[in-house]
Interface confidence: low
């Protein structure tokens, strides 16, 4: 897939520059398996630069190919608290809205860990809002350095 | 944040092509918690290009965001030795100078596992020195598939 | 190291914007540890720009530094099945062809958890092939979201 | 400062059992791995067993195994070594000793009590 | 089981002169991480043994560092640079490769 005349011809940045590292808000209420997520330089080091936030979950704002990635710490947390119940501690980000494009990106256990982190490659359009589901009774902690969640376009 | 129109013209290299991939030369003495790194091709599939090290820390030579990544695995190691210890084996990365940019960036616990691996994006500055802090009794591994830690400039 | 003055004045496509994620396709026969990879918009959210697969093997077609990752999680899986054997189940990711650049690049062991994820820079050359291999008796979840493999070109 | 008191010893027929007791004292006992070796009278060093920091894991020499037992009471931070079948060449200063952490199969004995003497004679 | 041998058995040495104490196993010692799965106890006279090196050359938390540990594999070495008086004792080596952990027989220094 080569790019377009127009596109070599453009400044660099309108290729896509777009990128956003964010911090945990908060939780959401009991039915609610979301975290919602905050960034700005008044918070720390997290930032967005393209993507915007809308009710704390990430929406993309410009077509491309995105490494997605992600931290989460639980915060109260032994290796016996995650491996306790018949349903481990899960943590999933996945295109949310709009509907029609739903579906899961990344998915990982806690099983008897206390963070999990990875990575991946993904497309993604403008619109998409990205979502990540924490299921179970264990709580994620809000320090910076231990839960994070970012995109950075890659390519068209 | 837009790119200026002088960056926009200059050549491609000038936007930053700075990146690491570094391998572990050492463990500090008794009382100093951090790794100690080594990069070239001499040495395998390490290297500098842009970063530079000061002591067998990172150091920074050009602001932007950059992709900061680490994975360690502890060499002498079973599922019960990493959580023998009322407080786990921790691997810290940080600002660790200037020391008045001092701050963790990135901060995972072994507890019941053997192998550390994350990434996140944050921004650095000309003269940022990162250091990477173990924590604990337990060594890392020298193996250059098991242990390395790198950075890689990703936009201004 | 400095782009030429050819790289330059070359559209920016001929930088290279090499990048591929893949989905498992499925496991090797009895002697054969190496997952057999897929990708392909029909297929779900994977793709291949550049390089190409050789029988489930990915091949580098462009030189350069490439940021390599990869997720992988195990189907049926408890803390106890990955930490009963005296080898733990392990997942490698290294150069098999050329026999005279083959090396282990990546190396993870599953220990007391289902999941592994991981990335690094790693150089590769043009006819580069990267292999997977999972050695130990446990088979890999085939889900999109629990198990890929990806590279991305990020510099010459 | 870290401490290890042994207790127990003393003689014992041929045939039957001793309960060694180990007492920890300045440290997080249930943080640590815990072993027990031996040394007969004028003789060198024999690891005899361990004992993770839970007691999920324990491990026997071939000489003692299916006769000594090891196990552990973390609320009373003490150790223990049950011995049973004694043989006189059981015959020994049973030391415990801190494992430092230092690798998962619990190398490096980084504190040493003082040692309590077993004599198996008729 | 891995056996263990250590030479000299007895090491007669000079206050301030250097000393070297062999320790061989019967297989080896070096794991796939890189590291020697060995370590090295002092026993002073009338006295429990004392933590010196471990992984075959990493000095123990307070030991002296006249005292050193190198070796690979199958064959290592204890040096002391230059002995002291407080030394003198029983010096063992110990493989924790594997279970059962097995040590060597102790090599005796004194002074001459």
């Known amino acids: 897939q080569r790019l377009s005349r127009a596109q070599q011809q453009l400044p660099l940045e309108s290729l896509g520059w777009d990128i956003a590292e964010l911090q945990l808000n908060h939780t959401g209420p009991q039915q609610d398996p979301r975290l919602y997520w905050q960034g700005g330089p008044a918070l720390g080091r997290s930032f967005l630069r393209g993507p915007e936030l809308d009710k704390g979950q990430l929406r993309i704002r410009r077509d491309g190919i995105y490494m997605v990635h992600i931290q989460v710490t639980l915060a109260i947390c032994s290796s016996t608290s995650t491996s306790r119940h018949h349903h481990p501690t899960t943590l999933a980000v996945g295109i949310c809205s709009p509907a029609s494009r739903s579906i899961s990106l990344l998915r990982l256990s806690f099983h008897q860990g206390c963070t999990i982190a990875s990575q991946r490659l993904t497309p993604l359009a403008r619109g998409d809002t990205l979502c990540t589901n924490l299921t179970g009774t264990l709580l994620p902690s809000r320090n910076t350095d231990e839960t994070f969640f970012g995109v950075q376009w890659v390519r068209p | 944040q837009r790119l200026s129109r002088a960056q926009q013209q200059l050549p491609l290299e000038s936007l930053g092509w700075d990146i690491a991939e570094l391998q572990l030369n050492h463990t500090g003495p008794q009382q100093d918690p951090r790794l100690y790194w080594q990069g070239g091709p001499a040495l395998g599939r390490s290297f500098l290009r842009g970063p530079e090290l000061d002591k067998g820390q990172l150091r920074i030579r050009r602001d932007g965001i950059y992709m900061v990544h680490i994975q360690v695995t502890l060499a002498i190691c079973s599922s019960t030795s990493t959580s023998r210890h009322h407080h786990p084996t921790t691997l810290a990365v940080g600002i660790c100078s200037p020391a008045s940019r001092s701050i963790s960036l990135l901060r995972l616990s072994f507890h019941q596992g053997c192998t550390i691996a994350s990434q996140r994006l944050t921004p650095l500055a000309r003269g940022d020195t990162l250091c990477t802090n173990l924590t604990g009794t337990l060594l890392p591994s020298r193996n250059t598939d098991e242990t390395f830690f790198g950075v890689q400039w990703v936009r201004p | 190291q400095r782009l030429s003055r050819a790289q330059q004045q070359l559209p920016l496509e001929s930088l290279g914007w090499d990048i591929a994620e893949l989905q498992l396709n499925h496991t090797g026969p009895q002697q054969d540890p190496r997952l057999y990879w897929q990708g392909g918009p029909a297929l779900g959210r994977s793709f291949l720009r550049g390089p190409e697969l050789d029988k489930g093997q990915l091949r580098i077609r462009r030189d350069g530094i490439y940021m390599v990752h990869i997720q992988v999680t195990l189907a049926i899986c408890s803390s106890t099945s990955t930490s009963r054997h005296h080898h733990p189940t392990t997942l490698a990711v290294g150069i098999c062809s050329p026999a005279s650049r083959s090396i282990s690049l990546l190396r993870l062991s599953f220990h007391q958890g289902c999941t592994i994820a991981s990335q690094r820079l790693t150089p590769l050359a043009r006819g580069d092939t990267l292999c997977t291999n999972l050695t130990g008796t446990l088979l890999p979840s085939r889900n999109t979201d629990e198990t890929f493999f990806g590279v991305q070109w990020v510099r010459p | 400062q870290v401490q290890l008191v042994e207790s127990g010893g003393g003689v014992v027929q041929p045939g039957r059992s001793l309960r060694l007791s180990c007492a920890a004292s300045?440290?997080?006992?249930?943080?640590?791995?815990i072993h027990w070796v031996r040394q007969a009278p004028g003789k060198g060093l024999e690891w005899v067993a361990v004992?993770?920091?839970?007691?999920?894991?324990?491990y026997y020499a071939d000489s003692v195994k299916g006769r000594f037992t090891i196990s552990r009471d973390n609320s009373k931070n003490t150790l223990y070594l049950q011995m049973n079948s004694l043989r006189a060449e059981d015959t020994a200063v049973y030391y415990c000793?801190?494992?430092?952490?230092?690798?998962?199969?619990?190398?490096?004995?980084?504190?040493w009590g003082q040692g309590t003497l077993v004599t198996v004679s008729s | 089981d891995i056996v263990m041998t250590q030479s000299p058995l007895s090491l007669p040495v000079t206050p301030g002169e250097p000393a070297s104490i062999s320790c061989r196993s019967s297989?080896?010692?070096?794991?796939?991480?890189?590291?020697?799965?060995l370590d090295w106890y002092l026993q002073k006279p009338g006295q429990s043994p004392q933590f010196l090196i471990y992984?075959?050359?990493y000095r123990a938390s307070g030991v002296p560092d006249r005292f050193s540990g190198s070796g690979s594999g199958t064959d290592f070495t204890l040096r002391i640079s230059r002995v002291e008086a407080e030394d003198v004792g029983v010096y063992y080596c110990?493989?924790?490769?594997?279970?059962?952990?097995?040590f060597g027989p102790g090599t005796k220094v004194d002074i001459k």
């Open positions: 000793a801190r494992d430092g952490g230092y690798s998962g199969y619990d190398s490096g004995f980084d504190y």
């Open positions: 300045g440290f997080t006992f249930s943080n640590y791995g």
């Open positions: 004992i993770w920091y839970d007691g999920s894991n324990k």
């Open positions: 297989q080896s010692l070096l794991n796939s991480n890189g590291y020697n799965y």
């Open positions: 992984l075959g050359s």
């Open positions: 110990i493989q924790t490769l594997q279970t059962p952990f097995t």
